[in-house]
Interface confidence: medium
């Protein structure tokens, strides 16, 4: 069965239709296209011979249009005027004419919307929104987008004078968009241009970089404080809750023990008139704010039960430190057999027992800091009766 | 019964002129593209020119381009081939022939029985 | 020289299948329907194929039509005394915007 089918159905004024043609049959020797629900000579748009791959006028035709080989019709730039019915003739090789009929609807097109706010400049957690999409137009579709994406489901999101307008109740930092809004009728759709919110909020608690507590004496002290804030946050500096200035930045040069104290960071926002402040304790010391890892070595690591005995020596070039043991996580001593000597660096064991064997480590560490040395695995073994010239039976 | 009878053909002249006609009987001549085709003496069959039903479309061979011109009166039911500046080798019989896809896919069905153009000195 | 090409000659035997060849090009045979004629001597040529392979009514199907690329073929089986004739393919050439014939092939049936 022949068919037509208008691709699409529905046709922006001004845009392009495609006539298609379904179940052509194989062997044609031509067809012609028709405005109108019937073959009239005199409504004839256009006729297309297959042999001489050639197309012919006819009296309806505009000069907008255009046939394929496949039969499909395309008319370009179209008018309401074009709304209606188009009919098909087929020439086929048995000298059988078929004929179909199709239709198609011609729309205006949609202009390109705008958002219009009550509000570009909201306070967090204080202002709400309404944006309206204009201009308002019969037989329309509105939509918004919120960063390229379809409204979230939110009971902060509310939807009013047929979608055409969105309220943002309470704003916060990030609902800044961009928000777009749409238009759609059946043939064509347009969007805004994107409109952003400037949201006023913060400062929320500062943060002092770097983390650090503790500095060596003659290093330089050098701390920066950051809060998210719109605008900006104005910054000051406290030490010992003396006022010392106002910036973000706070640089001591050649610090002394006398430098030790709290710092803190204050930030303000002039336009919510808001402050939040943060305090950072700094320690100046001579001891080493990092333990270098240190290592273990055993005079021997493989021993005879009851007979052997072995020591475990923790080596470590920090100084003003503390040295403690481990084995399978408990400390030692724990047995009478075990001694530590020369400021803990040394652990002895002697004799070496069954229960000796296992995993040995050492932790290194002073007031401020702290680092423990790789596991050393103690085996202890138990002779069998002894063979007459060490030999192994044969 | 559909039939198609050619005339005017006779001896004429290099150079000369001369005037064909087909006349349709047995079925609605508008409906149809007509052809002329020619075959000299001895040889084999060589397409002259179409025209389709309504005359708005025409195509003619190369050898005749600017020199035969085809055309029709339905009101009559006639095609007519005028001959103009003819040369020897025009002579041949010209049939008139029914096309009956409407010139979508030329292929002739029904052929008069043709008339001798003969172009001789 | 004709633009489709056929043998001059072909024959056969009565009862025999005969085959007539016709080559053409993309432009004619390849892209456009083909007919085939019938010319006995001393008469206007006579439709027996078009659209490659359809026979108009009253054609016997002992003559079929075929086409393959930029050839096609006529083949007459129980080859028949009467069937002693020229034959010519035809077909719409789209670069020449012209109708188009093979030379012709002159059929001897034998015996």
């Known amino acids: 069965q022949l068919t037509t089918e208008s691709m699409p159905f529905n046709v922006a004024e001004g845009k392009e239709v495609l006539l298609l043609v379904h179940n052509l049959p194989q062997q044609l020797f031509g067809y012609s296209w028709y405005k109108g629900e019937r073959v009239d000579g005199n409504r004839q748009i256009v006729g297309y011979a297959i042999g001489t791959q050639q197309a012919t006028p006819g009296p309806a035709n505009s000069g907008r249009e255009t046939i394929y080989p496949n039969a499909s019709l395309l008319i370009q730039n179209v008018t309401q005027n074009d709304t209606g019915f188009y009919t098909l003739q087929v020439i086929k090789s048995d000298l059988v004419n078929e004929e179909a009929t199709g239709q198609f609807h011609v729309y205006p097109e949609l202009p390109k919307p705008s958002i219009s706010s009550n509000n570009s400049n909201p306070v967090e957690d204080k202002d709400a929104v309404a944006f309206t999409c204009e201009p308002e137009t019969q037989d329309t579709t509105y939509l918004w987008w919120i960063n390229n994406q379809s409204l979230p489901v939110s009971p902060r999101l509310q939807l009013s004078n047929g979608n055409r307008t969105l309220t943002l109740l309470s704003v916060t930092r990030n609902d800044t968009g961009p928000y777009e809004c749409e238009i759609q009728n059946p043939v064509s759709a347009n969007r805004s241009d994107p409109v952003t919110l400037n949201v006023t909020y913060g400062p929320d608690t500062p943060t002092i970089s770097p983390s650090d507590t503790y500095y060596r004496p003659g290093a330089n002290l050098s701390l920066s404080c950051y809060a998210a804030s719109n605008p900006p946050a104005q910054y000051s500096w406290l030490i010992n809750g003396t006022f010392q200035q106002s910036t973000q930045e706070l640089f001591i040069p050649n610090i002394t023990v006398n430098n030790s104290g709290s710092y803190t960071c204050h930030a303000n926002n002039s336009v919510t008139g808001c402050n939040r402040t943060t305090v950072k304790t700094i320690i100046v010391t001579e001891l080493s704010p990092v333990v270098a890892k240190p290592q273990i070595k055993a005079s021997k690591t493989t021993v005879t039960g009851d007979k052997d005995s072995v020591n475990l020596t923790c080596s470590t070039n920090d100084t003003g430190i503390s040295i403690r043991w481990f084995f399978k996580n408990q400390s030692l001593p724990s047995s009478e057999r075990m001694k530590l000597s020369q400021g803990n660096t040394t652990l002895s064991i002697n004799p070496v027992k069954r229960e000796d064997a296992g995993t040995y480590w050492c932790e290194v560490f002073n007031p401020i800091s702290k680092n423990q040395s790789d596991p050393i695995m103690l085996n202890v073994n138990y002779n069998a009766l002894p063979q007459e010239n060490g030999l192994s039976p044969g | 019964e559909v039939q198609l009878l050619e005339s005017g053909g006779g001896l004429v002249q290099p150079g000369g002129s001369l005037r064909l006609s087909c006349a349709a009987s047995g079925f609605t001549f508008s409906n149809y593209a007509m052809s002329w085709v020619r075959q000299a003496p001895g040889k084999g069959l060589e397409w002259v020119s179409v025209i389709s039903h309504g005359g708005g479309s025409i195509y003619y061979a190369d050898s005749v381009k600017g020199r035969l011109t085809i055309s029709r009166d339905n009101s009559k039911n006639t095609l007519y081939l005028q001959m103009n500046s003819l040369r020897a080798e025009d002579t041949a019989v010209y049939y008139c022939?029914?096309?009956?896809?409407?010139?979508?896919?030329?292929?002739?069905?029904?052929w008069g029985q043709g008339t001798l153009v003969t172009v001789s000195s | 020289q004709s633009v489709l090409t056929q043998p001059p000659s072909a024959s056969g035997t009565p009862g025999q299948r005969v085959t007539i060849s016709c080559s053409g090009s993309?432009?004619?045979?390849?892209?456009?329907?083909v007919s085939w004629y019938q010319q006995l001597p001393g008469t206007a040529p006579k439709l027996l194929i078009y659209?490659?392979?359809k026979r108009p009514s009253g054609v016997p199907d002992r003559f079929s039509g075929s086409k393959s690329g930029t050839s096609a073929s006529l083949a007459i089986s129980g080859l028949r005394s009467e069937d002693e004739a020229d034959y010519y393919c035809?077909?719409?050439?789209?670069?020449?915007?012209?109708?188009?014939f093979g030379g012709g092939t002159k059929l001897t049936v034998l015996g």
């Open positions: 035809g077909a719409w050439d789209s670069m020449g915007n012209g109708y188009v």
């Open positions: 993309s432009s004619n045979i390849g892209n456009n329907y």
């Open positions: 022939a029914r096309d009956p896809t409407k010139g979508y896919a030329p292929t002739f069905d029904y």
């Open positions: 659209a490659d392979s």
